[in-house]
């Protein structure tokens, strides 16, 4: 059955249930998504606007699928395996009485059985597991998974643990104001930019004349030197870093497990080996991937790439090209491409370079 | 490629019956939800019957319930929509569809094949 | 019941054109709601799902919006190919269909 591609999901209580305080039901729910990330390499994230993997909605009767409730008792909720769309999303019968306790039909025991549906796990055949089709209130103080529970999810996302430390060459710093600097990958985290060369990356944070340089390896022991390319979904808290033709995922300035992963994952086909650079547009919702003179277009809500690429660099970025080494988005509306040790601010409305820089110009060289 | 080809239409009296066939390649075909659309000449689209991957759980139009019956063989990749008690206003071209994977239906049709028509007429 | 109500009917724009269509459900089905594109003689084609989300290979110039009640398909420059019937729909409900002409 199918499986959420990625470990970061995001889900969105979309209307809370009378029964209970709203503050409950966000707890019910926090720490029903929390039972499956103990255990997996999954992280979950709520968000209140904007279009989530995961919608949770309370709702009675005829509710906009093909499975109408049935008022209080029978069906309590039903959840969509991973998918686009309506996938993943976990209705509650609102017809029942929802509590925190074991009166009525406790939430957060629900929740999870619903949101084990929702990362594409089916019923269990174990009395004891709580994927198990028929509901029975177990005190939620000591409520665990069960073996059969555990080991259906770690055989869709397999377990916490973390990546196996990767070795670094040994090169020397560069010199930050050499006038030929360039840098193998720029992005934004935050509200800072990191520009990466080799084992090093320098920290830029907006506005501040300082700058920092810091070892790859000190921040991200389990990432390789040489980064390729690098991009950030901020709304997301995520950094994705590539080289060669694996990447990896930072949420939160921490590297996720059982990453690396294949860039092929994201679509590309089997002749692409690695990435040049890559940006995030958050006003359209793509990320733009640079591989030598060619660039795909993905679409991160739908997680495919977009039809009718790859296009030409030059043909649709004026006066870039025809091969770059990095990128990044900012201020709303430029791209910052970088080629060699030269640098170019790009409006990508005007769809015009509007200034030319060196790349160290970020650092008061 | 993902591909549905429908046949088994044709002219039926009134109270007869009719066995539509739905052949599906270019994709695992016990995994996805199917189900029939269909639309009367000159007229709108018509949800009439669904079935899950298995073949386990079954929905069916208001209009159509307890006359057409719904199924799958899926060794064959065929999906089935037999039809009795057949009456003028099932008149219709009759598609079949794609849905998502799962254990419940979205009601998300992405793929279509290009319909087989029904008369029903004396 | 959940009743889908389409409007317009029909619909006359020229090439170039910006076209909006209207889906109003009885109740709120949320974001669950799909847009079908058909031809004469043709079966339909899905173009928009969940509201919002375009359908691999559907050109960008077509747009879903809308949540709750009330929904939208827009087609922001029409183009020959683009008269058609077009239809909204939520689980076993479609409604009435927009046919979409040339003026």
């Known amino acids: 059955g199918p499986v959420w591609r990625k470990h970061y999901i995001t889900y969105r209580i979309n209307n809370y249930t009378p029964d209970m305080n709203r503050e409950d039901v966000d707890y019910a729910i926090r720490k029903a998504f929390q039972v499956w990330s103990n255990v997996t390499p999954l992280k979950f994230s709520k968000i209140n606007t904007g279009m989530a993997d995961i919608l949770v909605v309370f709702a009675r009767g005829a509710h906009g699928d093909f499975h109408a409730f049935d008022g209080k008792g029978g069906i309590l909720a039903h959840a969509f395996g991973p998918g686009s769309g309506i996938g993943g999303d976990a209705h509650f019968d609102e017809d029942e009485f929802w509590t925190t306790h074991s009166g009525g039909t406790n939430l957060f025991l629900t929740a999870v059985h619903e949101i084990g549906h929702s990362l594409g796990l089916g019923h269990s055949s174990d009395p004891k597991a709580v994927m198990f089709p028929t509901y029975k209130y177990v005190d939620i103080n000591t409520f665990r998974l069960s073996a059969d529970d555990i080991r259906g999810i770690q055989s869709l996302y397999g377990d916490p643990k973390e990546n196996q430390r990767l070795p670094n060459p040994d090169n020397s710093e560069p010199a930050l104001c050499d006038p030929n600097l360039s840098f193998d990958a720029v992005t934004t985290v935050g509200n800072k930019i990191f520009f990466f060369k080799d084992r090093f990356f320098w920290l830029k944070v907006s506005e501040r004349p300082k700058t920092s340089v810091n070892l790859i390896s000190s921040l991200w022991p389990t990432l390789p030197s040489g980064i390729e390319a690098a991009y950030e979904i901020e709304a997301r808290n995520q950094v994705f870093l590539f080289k060669d033709d694996k990447y990896w995922l930072i949420s939160n300035l921490r590297p996720e497990p059982n990453y690396p992963k294949s860039i092929h994952s994201f679509g590309f086909p089997n002749f692409v080996k690695k990435i040049d650079a890559a940006v995030f547009n958050p006003r359209f919702y793509r990320t733009y991937f640079f591989v030598d003179n060619q660039y795909w277009r993905y679409d991160e809500r739908r997680q495919m790439m977009d039809p009718g690429y790859p296009k030409l660099i030059t043909k649709n970025f004026q006066g870039i090209g025809p091969k770059i080494d990095a990128v990044f988005y900012s201020k709303n509306k430029y791209y910052y491409f970088f080629q060699g040790s030269n640098q170019f601010e790009y409006d990508f409305l005007l769809q015009r370079i509007t200034k030319t820089l060196k790349s160290n110009s970020w650092f008061g060289c | 490629e993902v591909q549905l080809l429908e046949s088994g239409g044709g002219l039926v009296q009134p109270g007869g019956s009719l066995r539509l066939s739905c052949a599906a390649s270019?994709?695992?075909?016990?995994?996805?939800?199917m189900h029939w659309v269909r639309q009367a000449p000159g007229k709108g689209l018509e949800w009439v019957s669904g079935?899950?991957?298995?073949?386990?759980?079954?929905m069916y139009a208001d209009s159509v319930k307890g006359r057409f019956t719904i199924s799958r063989d899926n060794s064959k990749n065929t999906l089935y929509l037999q039809m009795n008690s057949l009456r003028a206003e099932d008149t219709a071209v009759y598609y079949c569809?794609?849905?998502?994977?799962?254990?419940?239906?979205?009601?998300?049709?992405?793929?279509w094949g290009r319909g087989t028509l029904v008369t029903v007429s004396s | 019941d959940i009743q889908m109500t389409q409007s317009p009917s029909s619909l006359s724009a020229s090439v170039g054109d910006r076209v909006t269509i209207t889906c109003r459900a009885s109740?709120?089905?949320?974001?669950?709601l799909n847009w079908y594109q058909q031809k004469p003689g043709k079966a339909p084609k899905l173009l928009i799902y969940?509201?919002?989300s375009l359908q691999s290979g559907v050109p960008s110039r077509f747009s879903g919006s809308g949540s709750g009640t009330d929904f939208t398909l827009t087609i922001s420059s029409l183009q020959p190919e683009d008269f058609a019937t077009y239809y909204c729909?939520?689980?076993?409900?479609f409604g009435q269909g927009t046919k979409l002409e040339i003026k």
């Open positions: 969940a509201a919002s």
């Open positions: 270019g994709f695992t075909f016990s995994d996805y939800w």
């Open positions: 109740q709120s089905i949320y974001t669950y």
């Open positions: 079935i899950s991957g298995s073949g386990g759980s079954t």
């Open positions: 729909q939520q689980a076993g409900i």
């Open positions: 569809a794609r849905d998502i994977v799962g254990p419940y239906s979205a009601g998300l049709f992405d793929y």
